[in-house]
């Protein structure tokens, strides 16, 4: 099974090396998840032509995937550490239902999909420790998530393929924006 950063022998600090700081651990963790997304995207792109599809904007309108915007304070312009950290955690919590949807969408990369989901949960915990302003973080309602999951799973095959592609692309983009922002903190 895929290992999380810190479980791999390569990540264990050598006798004379410095242990990872909290920021370095988070950085490494996000990069680990991004590598997992890359593997999942590879399988998705190989089995369908969704990655080159021009119809994705149509499908995207029906998905409410978390997205970074300038007001979130994570971009270089208008950067705000507290606002941004809240946005990252809130966004990751919102992505959880979509990551759950991905669990039965892969054949050869089933373990990878599970690893992405589990390490995202761990990442949220890391970031919650880092956040001072926890009051501003809203957790999605379990009932809302359950009905969204049912709705997504009831789509036809083409829409399910498109949804998978869009979730992976959006999650990758969200994590990359998060990574860039966290490196400024």
């Amino acid at each position: 099974a895929p290992v999380l950063p810190g479980e791999d022998s390569k990540d264990v600090a050598a006798p004379h090396s410095q242990p990872l700081t909290s920021s370095e651990r988070i950085d490494k963790h996000i990069r680990y998840i991004l590598d997992g997304i890359s593997a999942l995207r590879k399988e998705t792109c190989n089995r369908s032509n969704m990655c080159e599809s021009s119809k994705e904007a149509l499908a995207e309108n029906n998905l409410n995937l978390p997205k970074m915007a300038e007001k979130d304070g994570c971009f270089q312009s208008g950067f705000n550490e507290d606002t941004c950290l809240v946005k990252i955690i809130t966004g990751l919590l919102e992505f959880e239902v979509y990551l759950e949807y991905l669990q039965n969408r892969f054949e050869s990369s089933e373990e990878q999909a599970r690893a992405v989901q589990m390490s995202t949960k761990v990442l949220i915990q890391f970031l919650q420790k880092k956040a001072k302003n926890l009051d501003a973080i809203t957790t999605p309602e379990p009932t809302t998530n359950a009905s969204l999951l049912t709705k997504l799973q009831a789509q036809n095959q083409w829409l399910q393929d498109m949804t998978t592609h869009l979730i992976l692309r959006s999650f990758k983009e969200f994590l990359q924006s998060s990574l860039r922002a966290l490196r400024q903190m």
């Epitope: 990069r31 991004l34 590598d35 997304i37 890359s38 080159e52 959006s170 990359q176 860039r180 490196r183």
Partner: antibody, heavy 123, light 107 residues
Amino acid sequence: QVQLVESGGGLVQPGGSLRLSCAASGFTFSNYYMTWVRQAPGKGLEWVSSIYSFSGDTAYADSVKGRFTISRDNAKNTLYLQMNSLKSEDTAVYYCTRNLGGVVVTTNGYDYWGQGTQVTVSS
Amino acid sequence: DVVMTQSPSSLPTSLGDSVTITCQASQSISDELSWYQQKPGQTPKLLIYGASKLQTGVPSRFSGSGSGTSFTLTISGLEAEDLATYYCLQGYSWPFMFGQGTKVELK
């Protein structure tokens, strides 16, 4: 094959404006980060600005912040650099570059470069 | 801002020599460092990304190492076509920054 072709350079007076364009072909433009890098005569390389694929996230060097604006038109496969309030120190060859793609998801590295367009700011 | 200090600025050498160029970051940049080669009148070319990963098509005599704040580009057995200026680039945090460059030339 991948091609990046810059245009829009030229001679402009201090305080003037120019808009550089970079026409991309041979790859799915919308999937890649794009960056402008410049090189003043006889000097080293200077990172100017980057724009990310779908987020609209942009970043600028301190030397151009507030004067330059990077943008992209994914439908036209074109990258732009709007340069306002130009100064003599902006004189350089401006290169359009593509960030590494594929499995490489975080590492910044510019794998394709255009031939560059000359910008000269002089009175 | 992360400041990159590249050394030496000039490196007189002989063909066949092993050449080492270093880049020092003012703070940790993980492995977000790339190396470029630029010959006179030509556009820069990516050699190494992720501190140590060799870009496709680049000869294996080029290698990169380092992590955190200290990075090295090594050319094992310099060839005539390697005479050029070399730059490092930190891609860890804004604003990204190139090193000042190292000109590799014959003694």
